[in-house]
């Protein structure tokens, strides 16, 4: 049986043009599903907002490495995938669509609490 058949699929259609302050980030997700137009990083801020970022950008690669390192320091055994558990909020310049598909993304978490930017999200049934 395929695992987690009804897990949500998060897709990014454009990327933030701004470099987000690292201090505002809590976690990230890798988006790799072929049902999405492009591979992407979705940063999750401490305010639980989600921001699509270009995984080819050097700052994005540096940030996700830092988040990986921090995550291993703070909770070495907790790597979890929960695109569903993360709330999207406040519209920004980045579109984010949710569809239903198994294991579309992986979430990597670290710390908690503060301020930030978000994305527009649409639920597709």
């Amino acid at each position: 049986q395929p695992d987690a058949v009804n897990a949500p699929l998060t897709c990014c259609y454009s990327f933030t043009s701004k470099m987000i302050p690292m201090s505002r980030l809590e976690s990230y997700k890798r988006i790799t599903s072929s049902r999405c137009p492009k591979e992407a990083v979705v940063f999750v801020t401490k305010l639980k907002r989600e921001v699509c970022a270009d995984p080819k950008k050097e700052w994005v690669q540096t940030y996700i490495k830092n988040l990986d390192r921090n995550q291993m320091r703070s909770e070495p055994t907790t790597l979890f995938k929960t695109a569903s558990a993360l709330r999207s909020s406040a519209p920004l310049n980045v579109k984010l669509t949710r569809k239903s598909e198994a294991n579309a993304s992986t979430t990597f978490s670290t710390t908690t609490s503060s301020t930030s930017v978000g994305v527009t999200s649409v639920t597709v049934n």
Epitope: R30, T32, S34, P37, K38, Q71, M72, L79
Partner: antibody, heavy 117, light 107 residues
């Protein structure tokens, strides 16, 4: 659906070069990295290098630096890997694969390259 | 370069068995580990990325665990279609490197 289709098998002489192609459909190759991985008969997998088709930037395993060339033609959504100064140890199946994060979720079917005198 | 050591190199098991394959990196790879399944004459198939995240369509009998330098692939109840060779791969830093593979054979 993402599909990577590679060119056919090649038989080459030692010292010569081979160029293998990988045509992508179902994705814009400018949005990903295209990697090349090889597998000698009965052996494990070995990463050769990758290209960012959007700008032509490449990265190689030092073992292949200078002998492997990876290029991409975004107009035809095709990536190429050329290996020069071939020796018998280069006999292998060569795979292209996509992946911006360094792991490979879609693979070509493989191209067998035989180096023999 | 980060070296990946996979063990065992081969194992014999029966349908229904629980199978565990381990992979050890020469340095911390911060969960940036992928597992692949390869059948003879075919390209590898991605099973797991990020040490634990199962790819779409991969049966839930496959699971990944581990952290730091030590990682494990577990098949909870081996099925006939699972007889294959399995590879781990680190994607923490280039050059990306693979383990030597584990061939899972029928007992």
């Amino acid at each position: 659906q993402v599909q990577l289709v590679q060119s056919g098998a090649e038989v080459k002489k030692p010292g010569s070069s081979v160029k293998v192609s990988c045509k992508a459909s179902g994705l814009n190759i400018k949005d990903t990295y295209m990697h090349w991985v090889r597998q000698a008969p009965g052996q494990g997998l070995e990463w050769i290098g990758r290209i960012d088709p959007a700008n032509g930037n490449t990265k190689f395993d030092p073992k292949f630096q200078g002998r492997a060339t990876i290029t991409a033609d975004t107009s035809t959504s095709t990536a190429y890997m050329e290996l020069s100064s071939l020796r018998s140890e280069d006999t292998a199946v060569y795979y292209c694969a996509r992946g911006v994060f360094g792991f490979f979720d879609y693979w070509g079917q493989g191209t067998t390259v035989t180096v023999s005198s | 370069d980060i070296q990946m050591t996979q063990s065992p190199s081969s194992l014999s098991a029966s349908v229904g068995d629980r199978v565990t394959i381990t992979c050890k990196a020469t340095e911390d790879i911060y969960n940036r580990l992928a597992w692949y399944q390869q059948k003879p004459g075919k390209a590898p198939k991605l099973l797991i990325s990020g040490a634990t995240s199962l790819e779409t369509g991969v049966p839930s009998r496959f699971s990944g665990s581990g952290s730091g330098t030590d990682y494990t692939l577990t098949i909870s109840s081996l099925q006939p279609e699972d007889f294959a060779t399995y590879y781990c791969q680190q994607f923490w830093s280039a050059p990306y490197t693979f383990g030597g593979g584990t061939k899972v054979e029928i007992k």
